[in-house]
C-alpha cells in the first residue's frame, strides 16, 4: 500500500505518527501473530546453530536457547527480528552479557518506541541522542533509572554519554540539583563531577554514600571539601555522632586527616569499636579511621641535613612525609614562584597545598595566588571562594595554567570571584576571558549577563556567541544595539549580526528595509517567535540573494514554522518550490495552546471556514 505523503488538513492537530500506529498494530499482534510464550527457565545456554535465523517465532524459543546467542547470529537478522528478539529476552528475563547487549543495541538502528518491552539493561547501550524530544527523553531516562548502570565501567563511552544527556533531559542547568533531580538520575548520580558535589552537597552526598566502587579524584576532593565545610546534611565534623558516621559509611574513604582530627575522638573510638564487631563493615572503611600513617608519624621529625633552606629541585625526591616535615610553609609562601619550575609529582603538590592551607586557613593572599602556577590545578572551588583576586595579572596567570583545557569548576569559581570583586564585567576582563575561553560569555546566566555594560560589547567577537542560547541573546542584543547605535547601515549590520538571535520582529522588519543580505546561518539562529510574523516579501528582502537557501532548510526551525504560517500563493512567488503553506480558502486559527502541544497550527478546511465566514458576515450585517 502506498502511504500518502500529503499533510492531512482536517484533524491535523496532534495526529499520532503513522509509525506509532503501525507499531501499535505490531504490538497487538496484527502484523506478526504472536505465540504463547514457552515457560522454560533453564539457565544454561543451548547451542544455537542458526536457531535465531529462521524460527517460526522468536518468542517460541526457550530462555535456555536465547541465553547464549552470539553477536554473529544477530548481525544476520532484520531490524524487526532483532526487536522481536529483544522483546522475547525481556519477557523471559534472560540475563545478557555486556557484549550481547552492545550487539543488540547496535542492531536496533531505529530508536525503539516500545522501551518498556525491551530488556532494561539494553537501554544503557542505546544512544540517548535518539530520544531527543522532551517526552521521548523523559520516557528513556525514567527507564534508565531502573537499569544497572554499573554494567558499564565508568570510562565506557556508552556510560559517559548518558549523564550529559540525562541532565539536559531533566532540564538541569548549572550544577545546582534538587532532591528530585538526584532521584531522577538514579545510578547516573554517581557519575556527577565534583562541581555538582560542591554546589549540591546537601542532596548529593547522601546519594554518593551508596555508590558502588570508588569516587574519582575530582568527586573525592569536592566531597571532602563539602564535609569539611560543615554544611548540611551532616554538619561540622566536630558535631558528628556515631549515627553520622554510620550514615557516611560509603564516604568514609574520602575523609582526610583534617576532617578526622575534627571528629570528637570519643565518637571515633566508639564508632570504631562498634564497627569492628560488625562483620558487615568492609575492611577498607574500617581502616580509614584507624590511627593513620603510623609509620610516617614516627618520621615526623625532619632528618638532619634535609631541612629545606629554599624551594629548589633538591626537593623532587623528598618523600611525602619528608616534604611535610622539612619544608617550612612560610618559606614556601615566599618562594611560590619557584614551585612551577620544579617537576614535582602530583602527590608532592598535594603536600605543598596542604602546607599553604594550614598557613592560610582563611584563604591565600594575592601575592601567593599570583604565583600558584600548576598548584592552582589542585585547588577546589571551596578553596577559591576564600580568595580575593583583584589583579587582572593574577587572573591571567592562573588562566594560563589551565590553557587548552575546558573551563574547569575551579576556573569558573575564580572568574566568578574576580568579576564579583570588580562589580561588573568590564572590557579588559571580557577581553581576557574571551581570549582564553571563547565560549565564556555563553556560560553566564541571563542575570549575570545583565551586569555587562554596553561598552564591553565591543570586545565580543562572533565566535564568542556561538554557544549562546536565545535567553542569553535576549539580554545581549539590546546592549549590542545600544553599543553600535552610532554606526552606519552596513557597518552596523556586520557588528550586530552575531547578536540577532535576540532581536524582536520589529527590528528584523527594519533590517529588511536596509538591503542587508543576511546569510542563512544567521537567519536560522533568529528567534522563531520573531520570524513568524514576517511576510514573504520581508524575508525575501532580509535575505536578498541568500533567499534561495530557504529550500534546503524548509524542514528546520524557524523556516519550517514560518512556512506553515505563510499563504502558499505567497511562497510560490519565491519560485523555490517551498511547500506546506496555507492553501487558498483555508483559515488559520491561532490556537496557541493546541499548537504548543502539537507543534503545528490547526487548519480548518473549506467547510468550517465557510461556516466561520458566514457567521462573520452575519455579525457584520447585524
Amino acid at each position: 500500500m502506498a502511504l500518502p505523503t500529503a499533510r492531512p488538513l482536517l484533524g491535523s492537530c496532534g495526529t499520532p505518527a503513522l509509525g506509532s500506529l503501525l507499531f501499535l498494530l505490531f504490538s497487538l499482534g496484527w502484523v506478526q501473530p504472536s505465540r504463547t510464550l514457552a515457560g522454560e527457565t533453564g539457565q544454561e545456554a543451548a547451542p544455537l546453530d542458526g536457531v535465531l535465523a529462521n524460527p517460526p517465532n522468536i518468542s517460541s524459543l526457550s530462555p535456555r536457547q536465547l541465553l547464549g546467542f552470539p553477536c554473529a547470529e544477530v548481525s544476520g537478522l532484520s531490524t524487526e527480528r532483532v526487536r522481536e528478539l529483544a522483546v522475547a529476552l525481556a519477557q523471559k528475563n534472560v540475563k545478557l552479557s555486556t557484549e550481547q547487549l552492545r550487539c543488540l543495541a547496535h542492531r536496533l538502528s531505529e530508536p525503539p518506541e516500545d522501551l518498556d518491552a525491551l530488556p532494561l539493561d539494553l537501554l544503557l547501550f542505546l544512544n540517548p541522542d535518539a530520544f531527543s524530544g522532551p517526552q521521548a527523553c523523559t520516557r528513556f531516562f525514567s527507564r534508565i533509572t531502573k537499569a544497572n548502570v554499573d554494567l558499564l565501567p565508568r570510562g565506557a563511552p556508552e556510560r559517559q554519554r548518558l549523564l550529559p544527556a540525562a541532565l539536559a533531559c531533566w532540564g538541569v542547568r548549572g550544577s545546582l540539583l534538587s532532591e528530585a533531580d538526584v532521584r531522577a538520575l538514579g545510578g547516573l548520580a554517581c557519575d556527577l563531577p565534583g562541581r555538582f558535589v560542591a554546589e549540591s552537597a546537601e542532596v548529593l552526598l547522601p546519594r554518593l554514600v551508596s555508590c558502588p566502587g570508588p569516587l574519582d579524584q575530582d568527586q573525592q576532593e569536592a566531597a571532602r571539601a563539602a564535609l569539611q565545610g560543615g554544611g548540611p546534611p551532616y554538619g561540622p565534623p566536630s558535631t558528628w555522632s556515631v549515627s553520622t558516621m554510620d550514615a557516611l559509611r560509603g564516604l568514609l574513604p574520602v575523609l582526610g586527616q583534617p576532617i578526622i582530627r575534627s571528629i570528637p575522638q570519643g565518637i571515633v573510638a566508639a564508632w570504631r569499636q562498634r564497627s569492628s564487631r560488625d562483620p558487615s563493615w568492609r575492611q577498607p572503611e574500617r581502616t580509614i579511621l584507624r590511627p593513620r600513617f603510623r609509620r610516617e608519624v614516627e618520621k615526623t621529625a625532619c632528618p638532619s641535613g634535609k631541612k629545606a633552606r629554599e624551594i629548589d629541585e633538591s626537593l623532587i625526591f623528598y618523600k611525602k612525609w619528608e616534604l611535610e616535615a622539612c619544608v617550612d610553609a612560610a618559606l614556601l609562601a615566599t618562594q611560590m614562584d619557584r614551585v612551577n619550575a620544579i617537576p614535582f609529582t602530583y602527590e608532592q603538590l598535594d603536600v605543598l597545598k596542604h602546607k599553604l592551607d594550614e598557613l592560610y586557613p582563611q584563604g591565600y593572599p594575592e601575592s601567593v595566588i599570583q604565583h600558584l602556577g600548576y598548584l592552582f590545578l589542585k585547588m577546589s572551588p571551596e578553596d577559591i571562594r576564600k580568595w580575593n583576586v583583584t589583579s587582572l595579572e593574577t587572573l591571567k596567570a592562573l588562566l594560563e595554567v589551565n590553557k587548552g583545557h575546558e573551563m574547569s569548576p575551579q576556573v569558573a569559581t575564580l572568574i566568578d570571584r574576580f568579576v564579583k570583586g570588580r562589580g561588573q564585567l568590564d572590557k579588559d576582563t571580557l577581553d581576557t576571558l574571551t581570549a582564553f575561553y571563547p565560549g565564556y560569555l555563553c556560560s553566564l546566566s541571563p542575570e549575570e549577563l545583565s551586569s555587562v555594560p554596553p561598552s564591553s560589547i565591543w570586545a565580543v567577537r562572533p565566535q564568542d556567541l556561538d554557544t549562546c542560547d536565545p535567553r542569553q541573546l535576549d539580554v545581549l542584543y539590546p546592549k549590542a544595539r545600544l553599543a553600535f547605535q552610532n554606526m552606519n547601515g552596513s557597518e552596523y549590520f556586520v557588528k550586530i549580526q552575531s547578536f540577532l538571535g535576540g532581536a524582536p520582529t520589529e527590528d528584523l522588519k527594519a533590517l529588511s528595509q536596509q538591503n542587508v543580505s543576511m546569510d542563512l546561518a544567521t537567519f536560522m539562529k533568529l528567534r522563531t517567535d520573531a520570524v513568524l510574523p514576517l511576510t514573504v516579501a520581508e524575508v525575501q528582502k532580509l535575505l536578498g540573494p541568500h533567499v534561495e537557501g530557504l529550500k534546503a532548510e524548509e524542514r528546520h526551525r524557524p523556516v519550517r514554522d514560518w512556512i506553515l504560517r505563510q499563504r502558499q500563493d505567497d511562497l510560490d512567488t519565491l519560485g523555490l518550490g517551498l511547500q506546506g503553506g496555507i492553501p487558498n480558502g483555508y483559515l488559520v486559527l491561532d490556537l496557541s495552546m493546541q499548537e504548543a502541544l502539537s507543534g503545528t497550527p490547526c487548519l480548518l478546511g473549506p467547510g468550517p471556514v465557510l461556516t466561520v465566514l458566514a457567521l462573520l458576515l452575519a455579525s457584520t450585517l447585524a
Epitope: P214, Q217, Q220, E313, S314, I316, F317, K319, K320, P343, F344, T345, Y346, E347, Q348, L349, Y374
Partner: antibody, heavy 121, light 107 residues
C-alpha cells in the same frame, strides 16, 4: 630524530660493578628529566632511577638505593648508571628513557634499545 | 609504594576485535596513568599518557579512560601489529610503578 643508545652491559660476578652509558641525540638533553628502567628476563618493567636538571637531583628505587648512582653530562648529552655491589636479582635489560614534556605525566616517551646486564658466578 | 594490577594477564583475540585491558591502582592516582606497548625483544613504546592523551604517532584506535583507581586501555579494532604486551604505569608519586603486563595473543 630523537634517539637514545645504551652501552656498557655485560656479564659480571655478584658483588662486581658495571657502568652503563646512554647517548642522547635529537633533543635538548639538559631540558629533560632522564630515567633508567629495567626488565628482568620474562618479567615486567621496573623503574630504577631518575635525574633532573644539571644532575644534582636524583632518585632511586629502594631495591638499588645505596648501590647504584645515576649521573649525567649535559655537555656530552650522556646519561650514566654506575652499578656497584651487583646481585643476581639485578640481572635485566636496562633501558634509558627520556621524560615526556607533558608536565606531571612522568611518562617515558623515548626509550633506548636496552643493554643486557647479567650477574652470575 | 603504589601497586598496579592489570587484568587479564593475557588474552586471545582476533584481528578486528575490540580489546579492553584494565589497570587498578592500590590508591587514588588522579589521572596520572600511562600505557605502553612492548613487542618481544624491543623497547617499550608510549601509547597514552595522563590517562587519555594519545602520544603523537599512535593510531586513534587506541584510547584510554578512567580516573582515581580504575583505568582502561581500549583497542577499538585490533590490527595484526597490535599483538604485544601492554603495561600501565602510575606517575602520581615516586617510586613510579608498572603493572605486571597483559599479553595480547592471536586467537
Amino acid at each position: 630524530e630523537v634517539q637514545l643508545v645504551e652501552s656498557g652491559g655485560g656479564l659480571v660476578q655478584p658483588g662486581g660493578s658495571l657502568r652503563l652509558s646512554c647517548a642522547a641525540s635529537g633533543f635538548t638533553f639538559s631540558d629533560y628529566g632522564m630515567h633508567w628502567v629495567r626488565q628482568a628476563p620474562g618479567k615486567g618493567l621496573e623503574w630504577v632511577s631518575s635525574i633532573y636538571g644539571s644532575g644534582g637531583h636524583t632518585g632511586y628505587a629502594d631495591s638499588v638505593k645505596g648501590r647504584f648512582t645515576i649521573s649525567r653530562d649535559n655537555s656530552k648529552n650522556t646519561l650514566y648508571l654506575q652499578m656497584n655491589s651487583l646481585r643476581a636479582e639485578d640481572t635485566a635489560v636496562y633501558y634509558c628513557a627520556k621524560q615526556h614534556a607533558y608536565r606531571y605525566s612522568y611518562a617515558f616517551d623515548v626509550w633506548g634499545q636496552g643493554t643486557l646486564v647479567t650477574v652470575s658466578s | 609504594d603504589i601497586q598496579m594490577t592489570q587484568s587479564p594477564s593475557s588474552l586471545s583475540a582476533s584481528v578486528g576485535d575490540r580489546v579492553t585491558i584494565t589497570c587498578r591502582a592500590s590508591q587514588s592516582i588522579s589521572n596520572w596513568l600511562n600505557w605502553y606497548q612492548q613487542k618481544p625483544g624491543k623497547a617499550p613504546k608510549l601509547l597514552i599518557y595522563a590517562t587519555s592523551s594519545l602520544q603523537s604517532g599512535v593510531p586513534s584506535r587506541f584510547s584510554g579512560s578512567g580516573s582515581g583507581t580504575d583505568f582502561t586501555l581500549t583497542i577499538s579494532s585490533l590490527q595484526p601489529e597490535d599483538f604485544a604486551t601492554y603495561y600501565c604505569q602510575q606517575s602520581y608519586s615516586f617510586p613510579f610503578t608498572f603493572g605486571q603486563g597483559t599479553k595480547v595473543e592471536i586467537k
